[in-house]
């Protein structure tokens, strides 16, 4: 039993540096505790952007200082990443882990390419 994770191929961040995408997983079992992690892949380096563990039916709780927020509905997680700048353009991978009850399952999406364009500074008005 494999766990498939789906996410959009491309997302364009808003002019305010906010990007949202859906991460959907096909659960092989009846998980009550799920961990969702957003990873950023740059070249061959993979780093954690944010992570949240949630009980099915409850809201995702990211750490207070996290740049991510999210909501869950069944096997679907709506993720929002804030504070993005042009230099943050890259591949963002959704990783899902079914933590409880056993058995543990791992699922990794193919990644969402998030494009971030810094807004042009407003010209001074005389």
């Amino acid at each position: 039993k494999a766990m498939h994770v789906a996410q959009p191929a491309v997302v364009l961040a808003s002019s305010r540096g906010i990007a949202s995408f859906v991460c959907e997983y096909a659960s092989p079992g009846k998980a009550t505790e799920v961990r969702v992690t957003v990873l950023r892949q740059a070249d061959s380096q993979v780093t954690e952007v944010c992570a949240a563990t949630y009980m099915m039916g409850n809201e995702l709780t990211f750490l207070d200082d996290s740049i991510c927020t999210g909501t869950s509905s069944g096997n679907q997680v709506n993720l929002t990443i804030q504070g993005l700048r042009a230099m943050d353009t890259g591949l963002y991978i959704c990783k899902v882990e079914l933590m409880y009850p056993p058995p543990y399952y791992l699922g990794i999406g193919n990644g969402t390419q998030i494009y971030v364009i810094d807004p042009e500074p407003c010209p001074d008005s005389d």
Epitope: K1, T53, E97, M99
Partner: antibody, heavy 118, light 106 residues
């Protein structure tokens, strides 16, 4: 750089207990799942146990379930394996390994040898 | 439990030759890794996700396969490649390893 250093191994009699430690450095310990893997002399690798992130979720191999307990102290960046009711077949080199961001065991310690013998 | 069976048990080859190692799973595997272990050393991650090379691994190492059949290929054996190689599945618990393939100098 990432470093994992095990300690606590030694020679112990069957039925006795031993506690292994794995000191981690060079990464944010609480963000990673941590595994124990063992290797009997001249044999292959055998997964023993894993503990996830905040320490609430743990899984064990059937061969050690009920006898071994995995734990972690994120404030000390240390992983533990409490081994009770030891048997001759538990004799092995015990290594800790980090579960990388994408799942595989990307860093391993050199291991600590446990010998169970009367 | 997913059982991984590696073949052959031992592979006798000369430096410069191509090595092909097989790993077969008892049921479909979603995530597979390959490790290299030299005597007295800890295992080293070579390949993850069946075909992605780990950081710092030379491109003579390549992985392929899906489902139940996986292959590790070393295109041209270097003296330092003679070691034991293990496959591992990490997509579900319990985590399991193959019994290993020893690549020795002919």
């Amino acid at each position: 750089q990432v470093q994992l250093v095990e300690s606590g191994g030694g020679v112990v009699q069957p039925g006795r207990s031993l506690r292994l430690s794995c000191a981690a450095s060079g990464f944010t310990f609480s963000r990673y799942g941590m595994h124990w893997v063992r290797q009997a002399p001249g044999k292959g690798l055998e997964w023993v146990a894993v503990i996830w992130y905040d320490g609430r979720n743990k899984y064990y191999a059937d061969s050690v379930k009920g006898r071994f307990t995995i734990s972690r102290d994120n404030s000390k960046n240390t992983l533990y394996l409490q081994m009770n009711s030891l048997r001759a077949e538990d004799t092995a080199l015990y290594s800790c390994a980090r579960a990388g961001e994408l799942g595989p065991f990307d860093y391993w310690g050199q291991g600590t040898l446990v010998t169970v013998s009367s | 439990e997913i059982v991984l069976t590696q073949s052959p048990g031992t592979l006798s080859l000369s430096p410069g030759e191509r090595a092909t190692l097989s790993c077969r799973a008892s049921q479909s595997v979603s995530y597979l890794a390959w490790y290299q272990q030299k005597p007295g050393q800890a295992p080293r991650l070579l390949i993850y996700g069946a075909s992605s090379r780990a950081t710092g691994i030379p491109d003579r190492f390549s992985g392929s396969g899906s489902g139940t059949d996986f292959t590790l290929t070393i295109s041209r054996l270097e003296p330092e490649d003679f070691a034991v190689y293990y496959c591992q599945q990490y997509g579900s618990s319990p985590w399991t390893f193959g019994q290993g393939t020893k690549v020795e100098i002919k």
